[in-house]
């Protein structure tokens, strides 16, 4: 009876369980009734980080200096290269594919702390009564306009991204 499932670190092919290739190696040929799975080590600047049946290894990530990147940890046959940013710059994502001097705070958020050489911009949501309608790396949330002090009334409520809209009071005839 041919197997329908295989053990861990094996795969099913042609009604047969074959061994997966270990990390750092790629598949050359599947096993047969008479031969083991054939695997080959990944080449220079290549890797595979799992037990696999891949026929091609992955290329190590390139830390492009034109994007402000440098190598934090050199890749091996089993691990990818880890990039980081030049000193004073910050990764734009966990994968660190590009660098920014500092991030900006989106509309609805204000700058709580301006970036320094060691820490990125810290943003905070604009609380009720405050707004920010811009992306900025220095502007705080601004208070809503006070219509009352201008002898006007609120015609449109403010949000975290928009100021209130003031208008003239309705005069009773």
């Amino acid at each position: 009876e041919p197997p329908t499932a295989c053990r861990e670190k094996q795969y099913l092919i042609n009604s047969q369980c074959c061994s997966l290739c270990q990390p750092g190696q790629k598949l050359v040929s599947d096993c047969t009734e008479f031969t083991e799975t054939e695997c080959l080590p990944c080449g220079e600047s290549e890797f595979l980080d799992t037990w696999n049946r891949e026929t091609h290894c992955h290329q190590h990530k390139y830390c492009d200096p034109n994007l402000g990147l440098r190598v934090q940890q050199k890749g091996t046959s089993e691990t990818d290269t880890i990039c980081t940013c030049e000193e004073g710059w910050h990764c734009t994502s966990e994968a660190c594919e590009s660098c920014v001097l500092h991030r900006s705070c989106s509309p609805g958020f204000g700058v709580k702390q301006i970036a320094t050489g060691v820490s990125d911009t810290i943003c905070e949501p604009c609380p009720v009564g405050f707004f920010s309608n811009v992306s900025s790396a220095f502007e705080k949330c601004h208070p809503w306009t006070s219509c009352e002090t201008k002898d006007l009334v609120v015609q449109q409520a403010g949000t975290n991204k928009t100021d209130v809209v003031c208008g003239p009071q309705d005069r009773l005839r």
Partner: nanobody, 116 residues
């Protein structure tokens, strides 16, 4: 292609003044917050000053407050930094940069040397 070209640096005596310019091209200048950032020899990056797109709001680092003035001319696509009462510790390469502040927008900068 975004280009930021800084100019106006040079050698100046302590107490002197300089006006830096940054000519911008390849984007709609009037829509962007702009910054001046400096790097002293062997030191980290210091954020010096910033200005909002309309030129109505500004930021200054404590180290330059009262001495430096940032401004912009949106009709000329140019950012300025007027530096007065210069001190030896203002010696640095000055860069202008734009939101979103990515590395590719980083120009060569202009060197300011304050020395007697």
């Amino acid at each position: 292609e975004v280009q930021l070209l800084e100019s106006g640096g040079g050698l100046v005596q302590p107490g002197g003044s300089l006006r830096l310019s940054c000519a911008a091209s390849g984007f709609t200048f009037r829509d962007y917050e702009m910054w001046w950032v400096r790097q002293a020899p062997g030191k980290g990056l210091e954020r010096v000053s910033a200005i909002n797109p309309q030129g109505t709001r500004t930021y200054y680092a404590d180290s330059v407050k009262g001495r430096f003035t940032i401004s912009r001319d949106n009709s000329k696509n140019t950012l300025y930094l007027q530096m007065n009462s210069l001190r030896a510790d203002d010696t640095a390469v000055y860069h202008c940069t734009k939101l979103p502040f990515i590395f590719e927008y980083w120009g060569q900068g202009t060197l300011v040397t304050v020395s007697s």
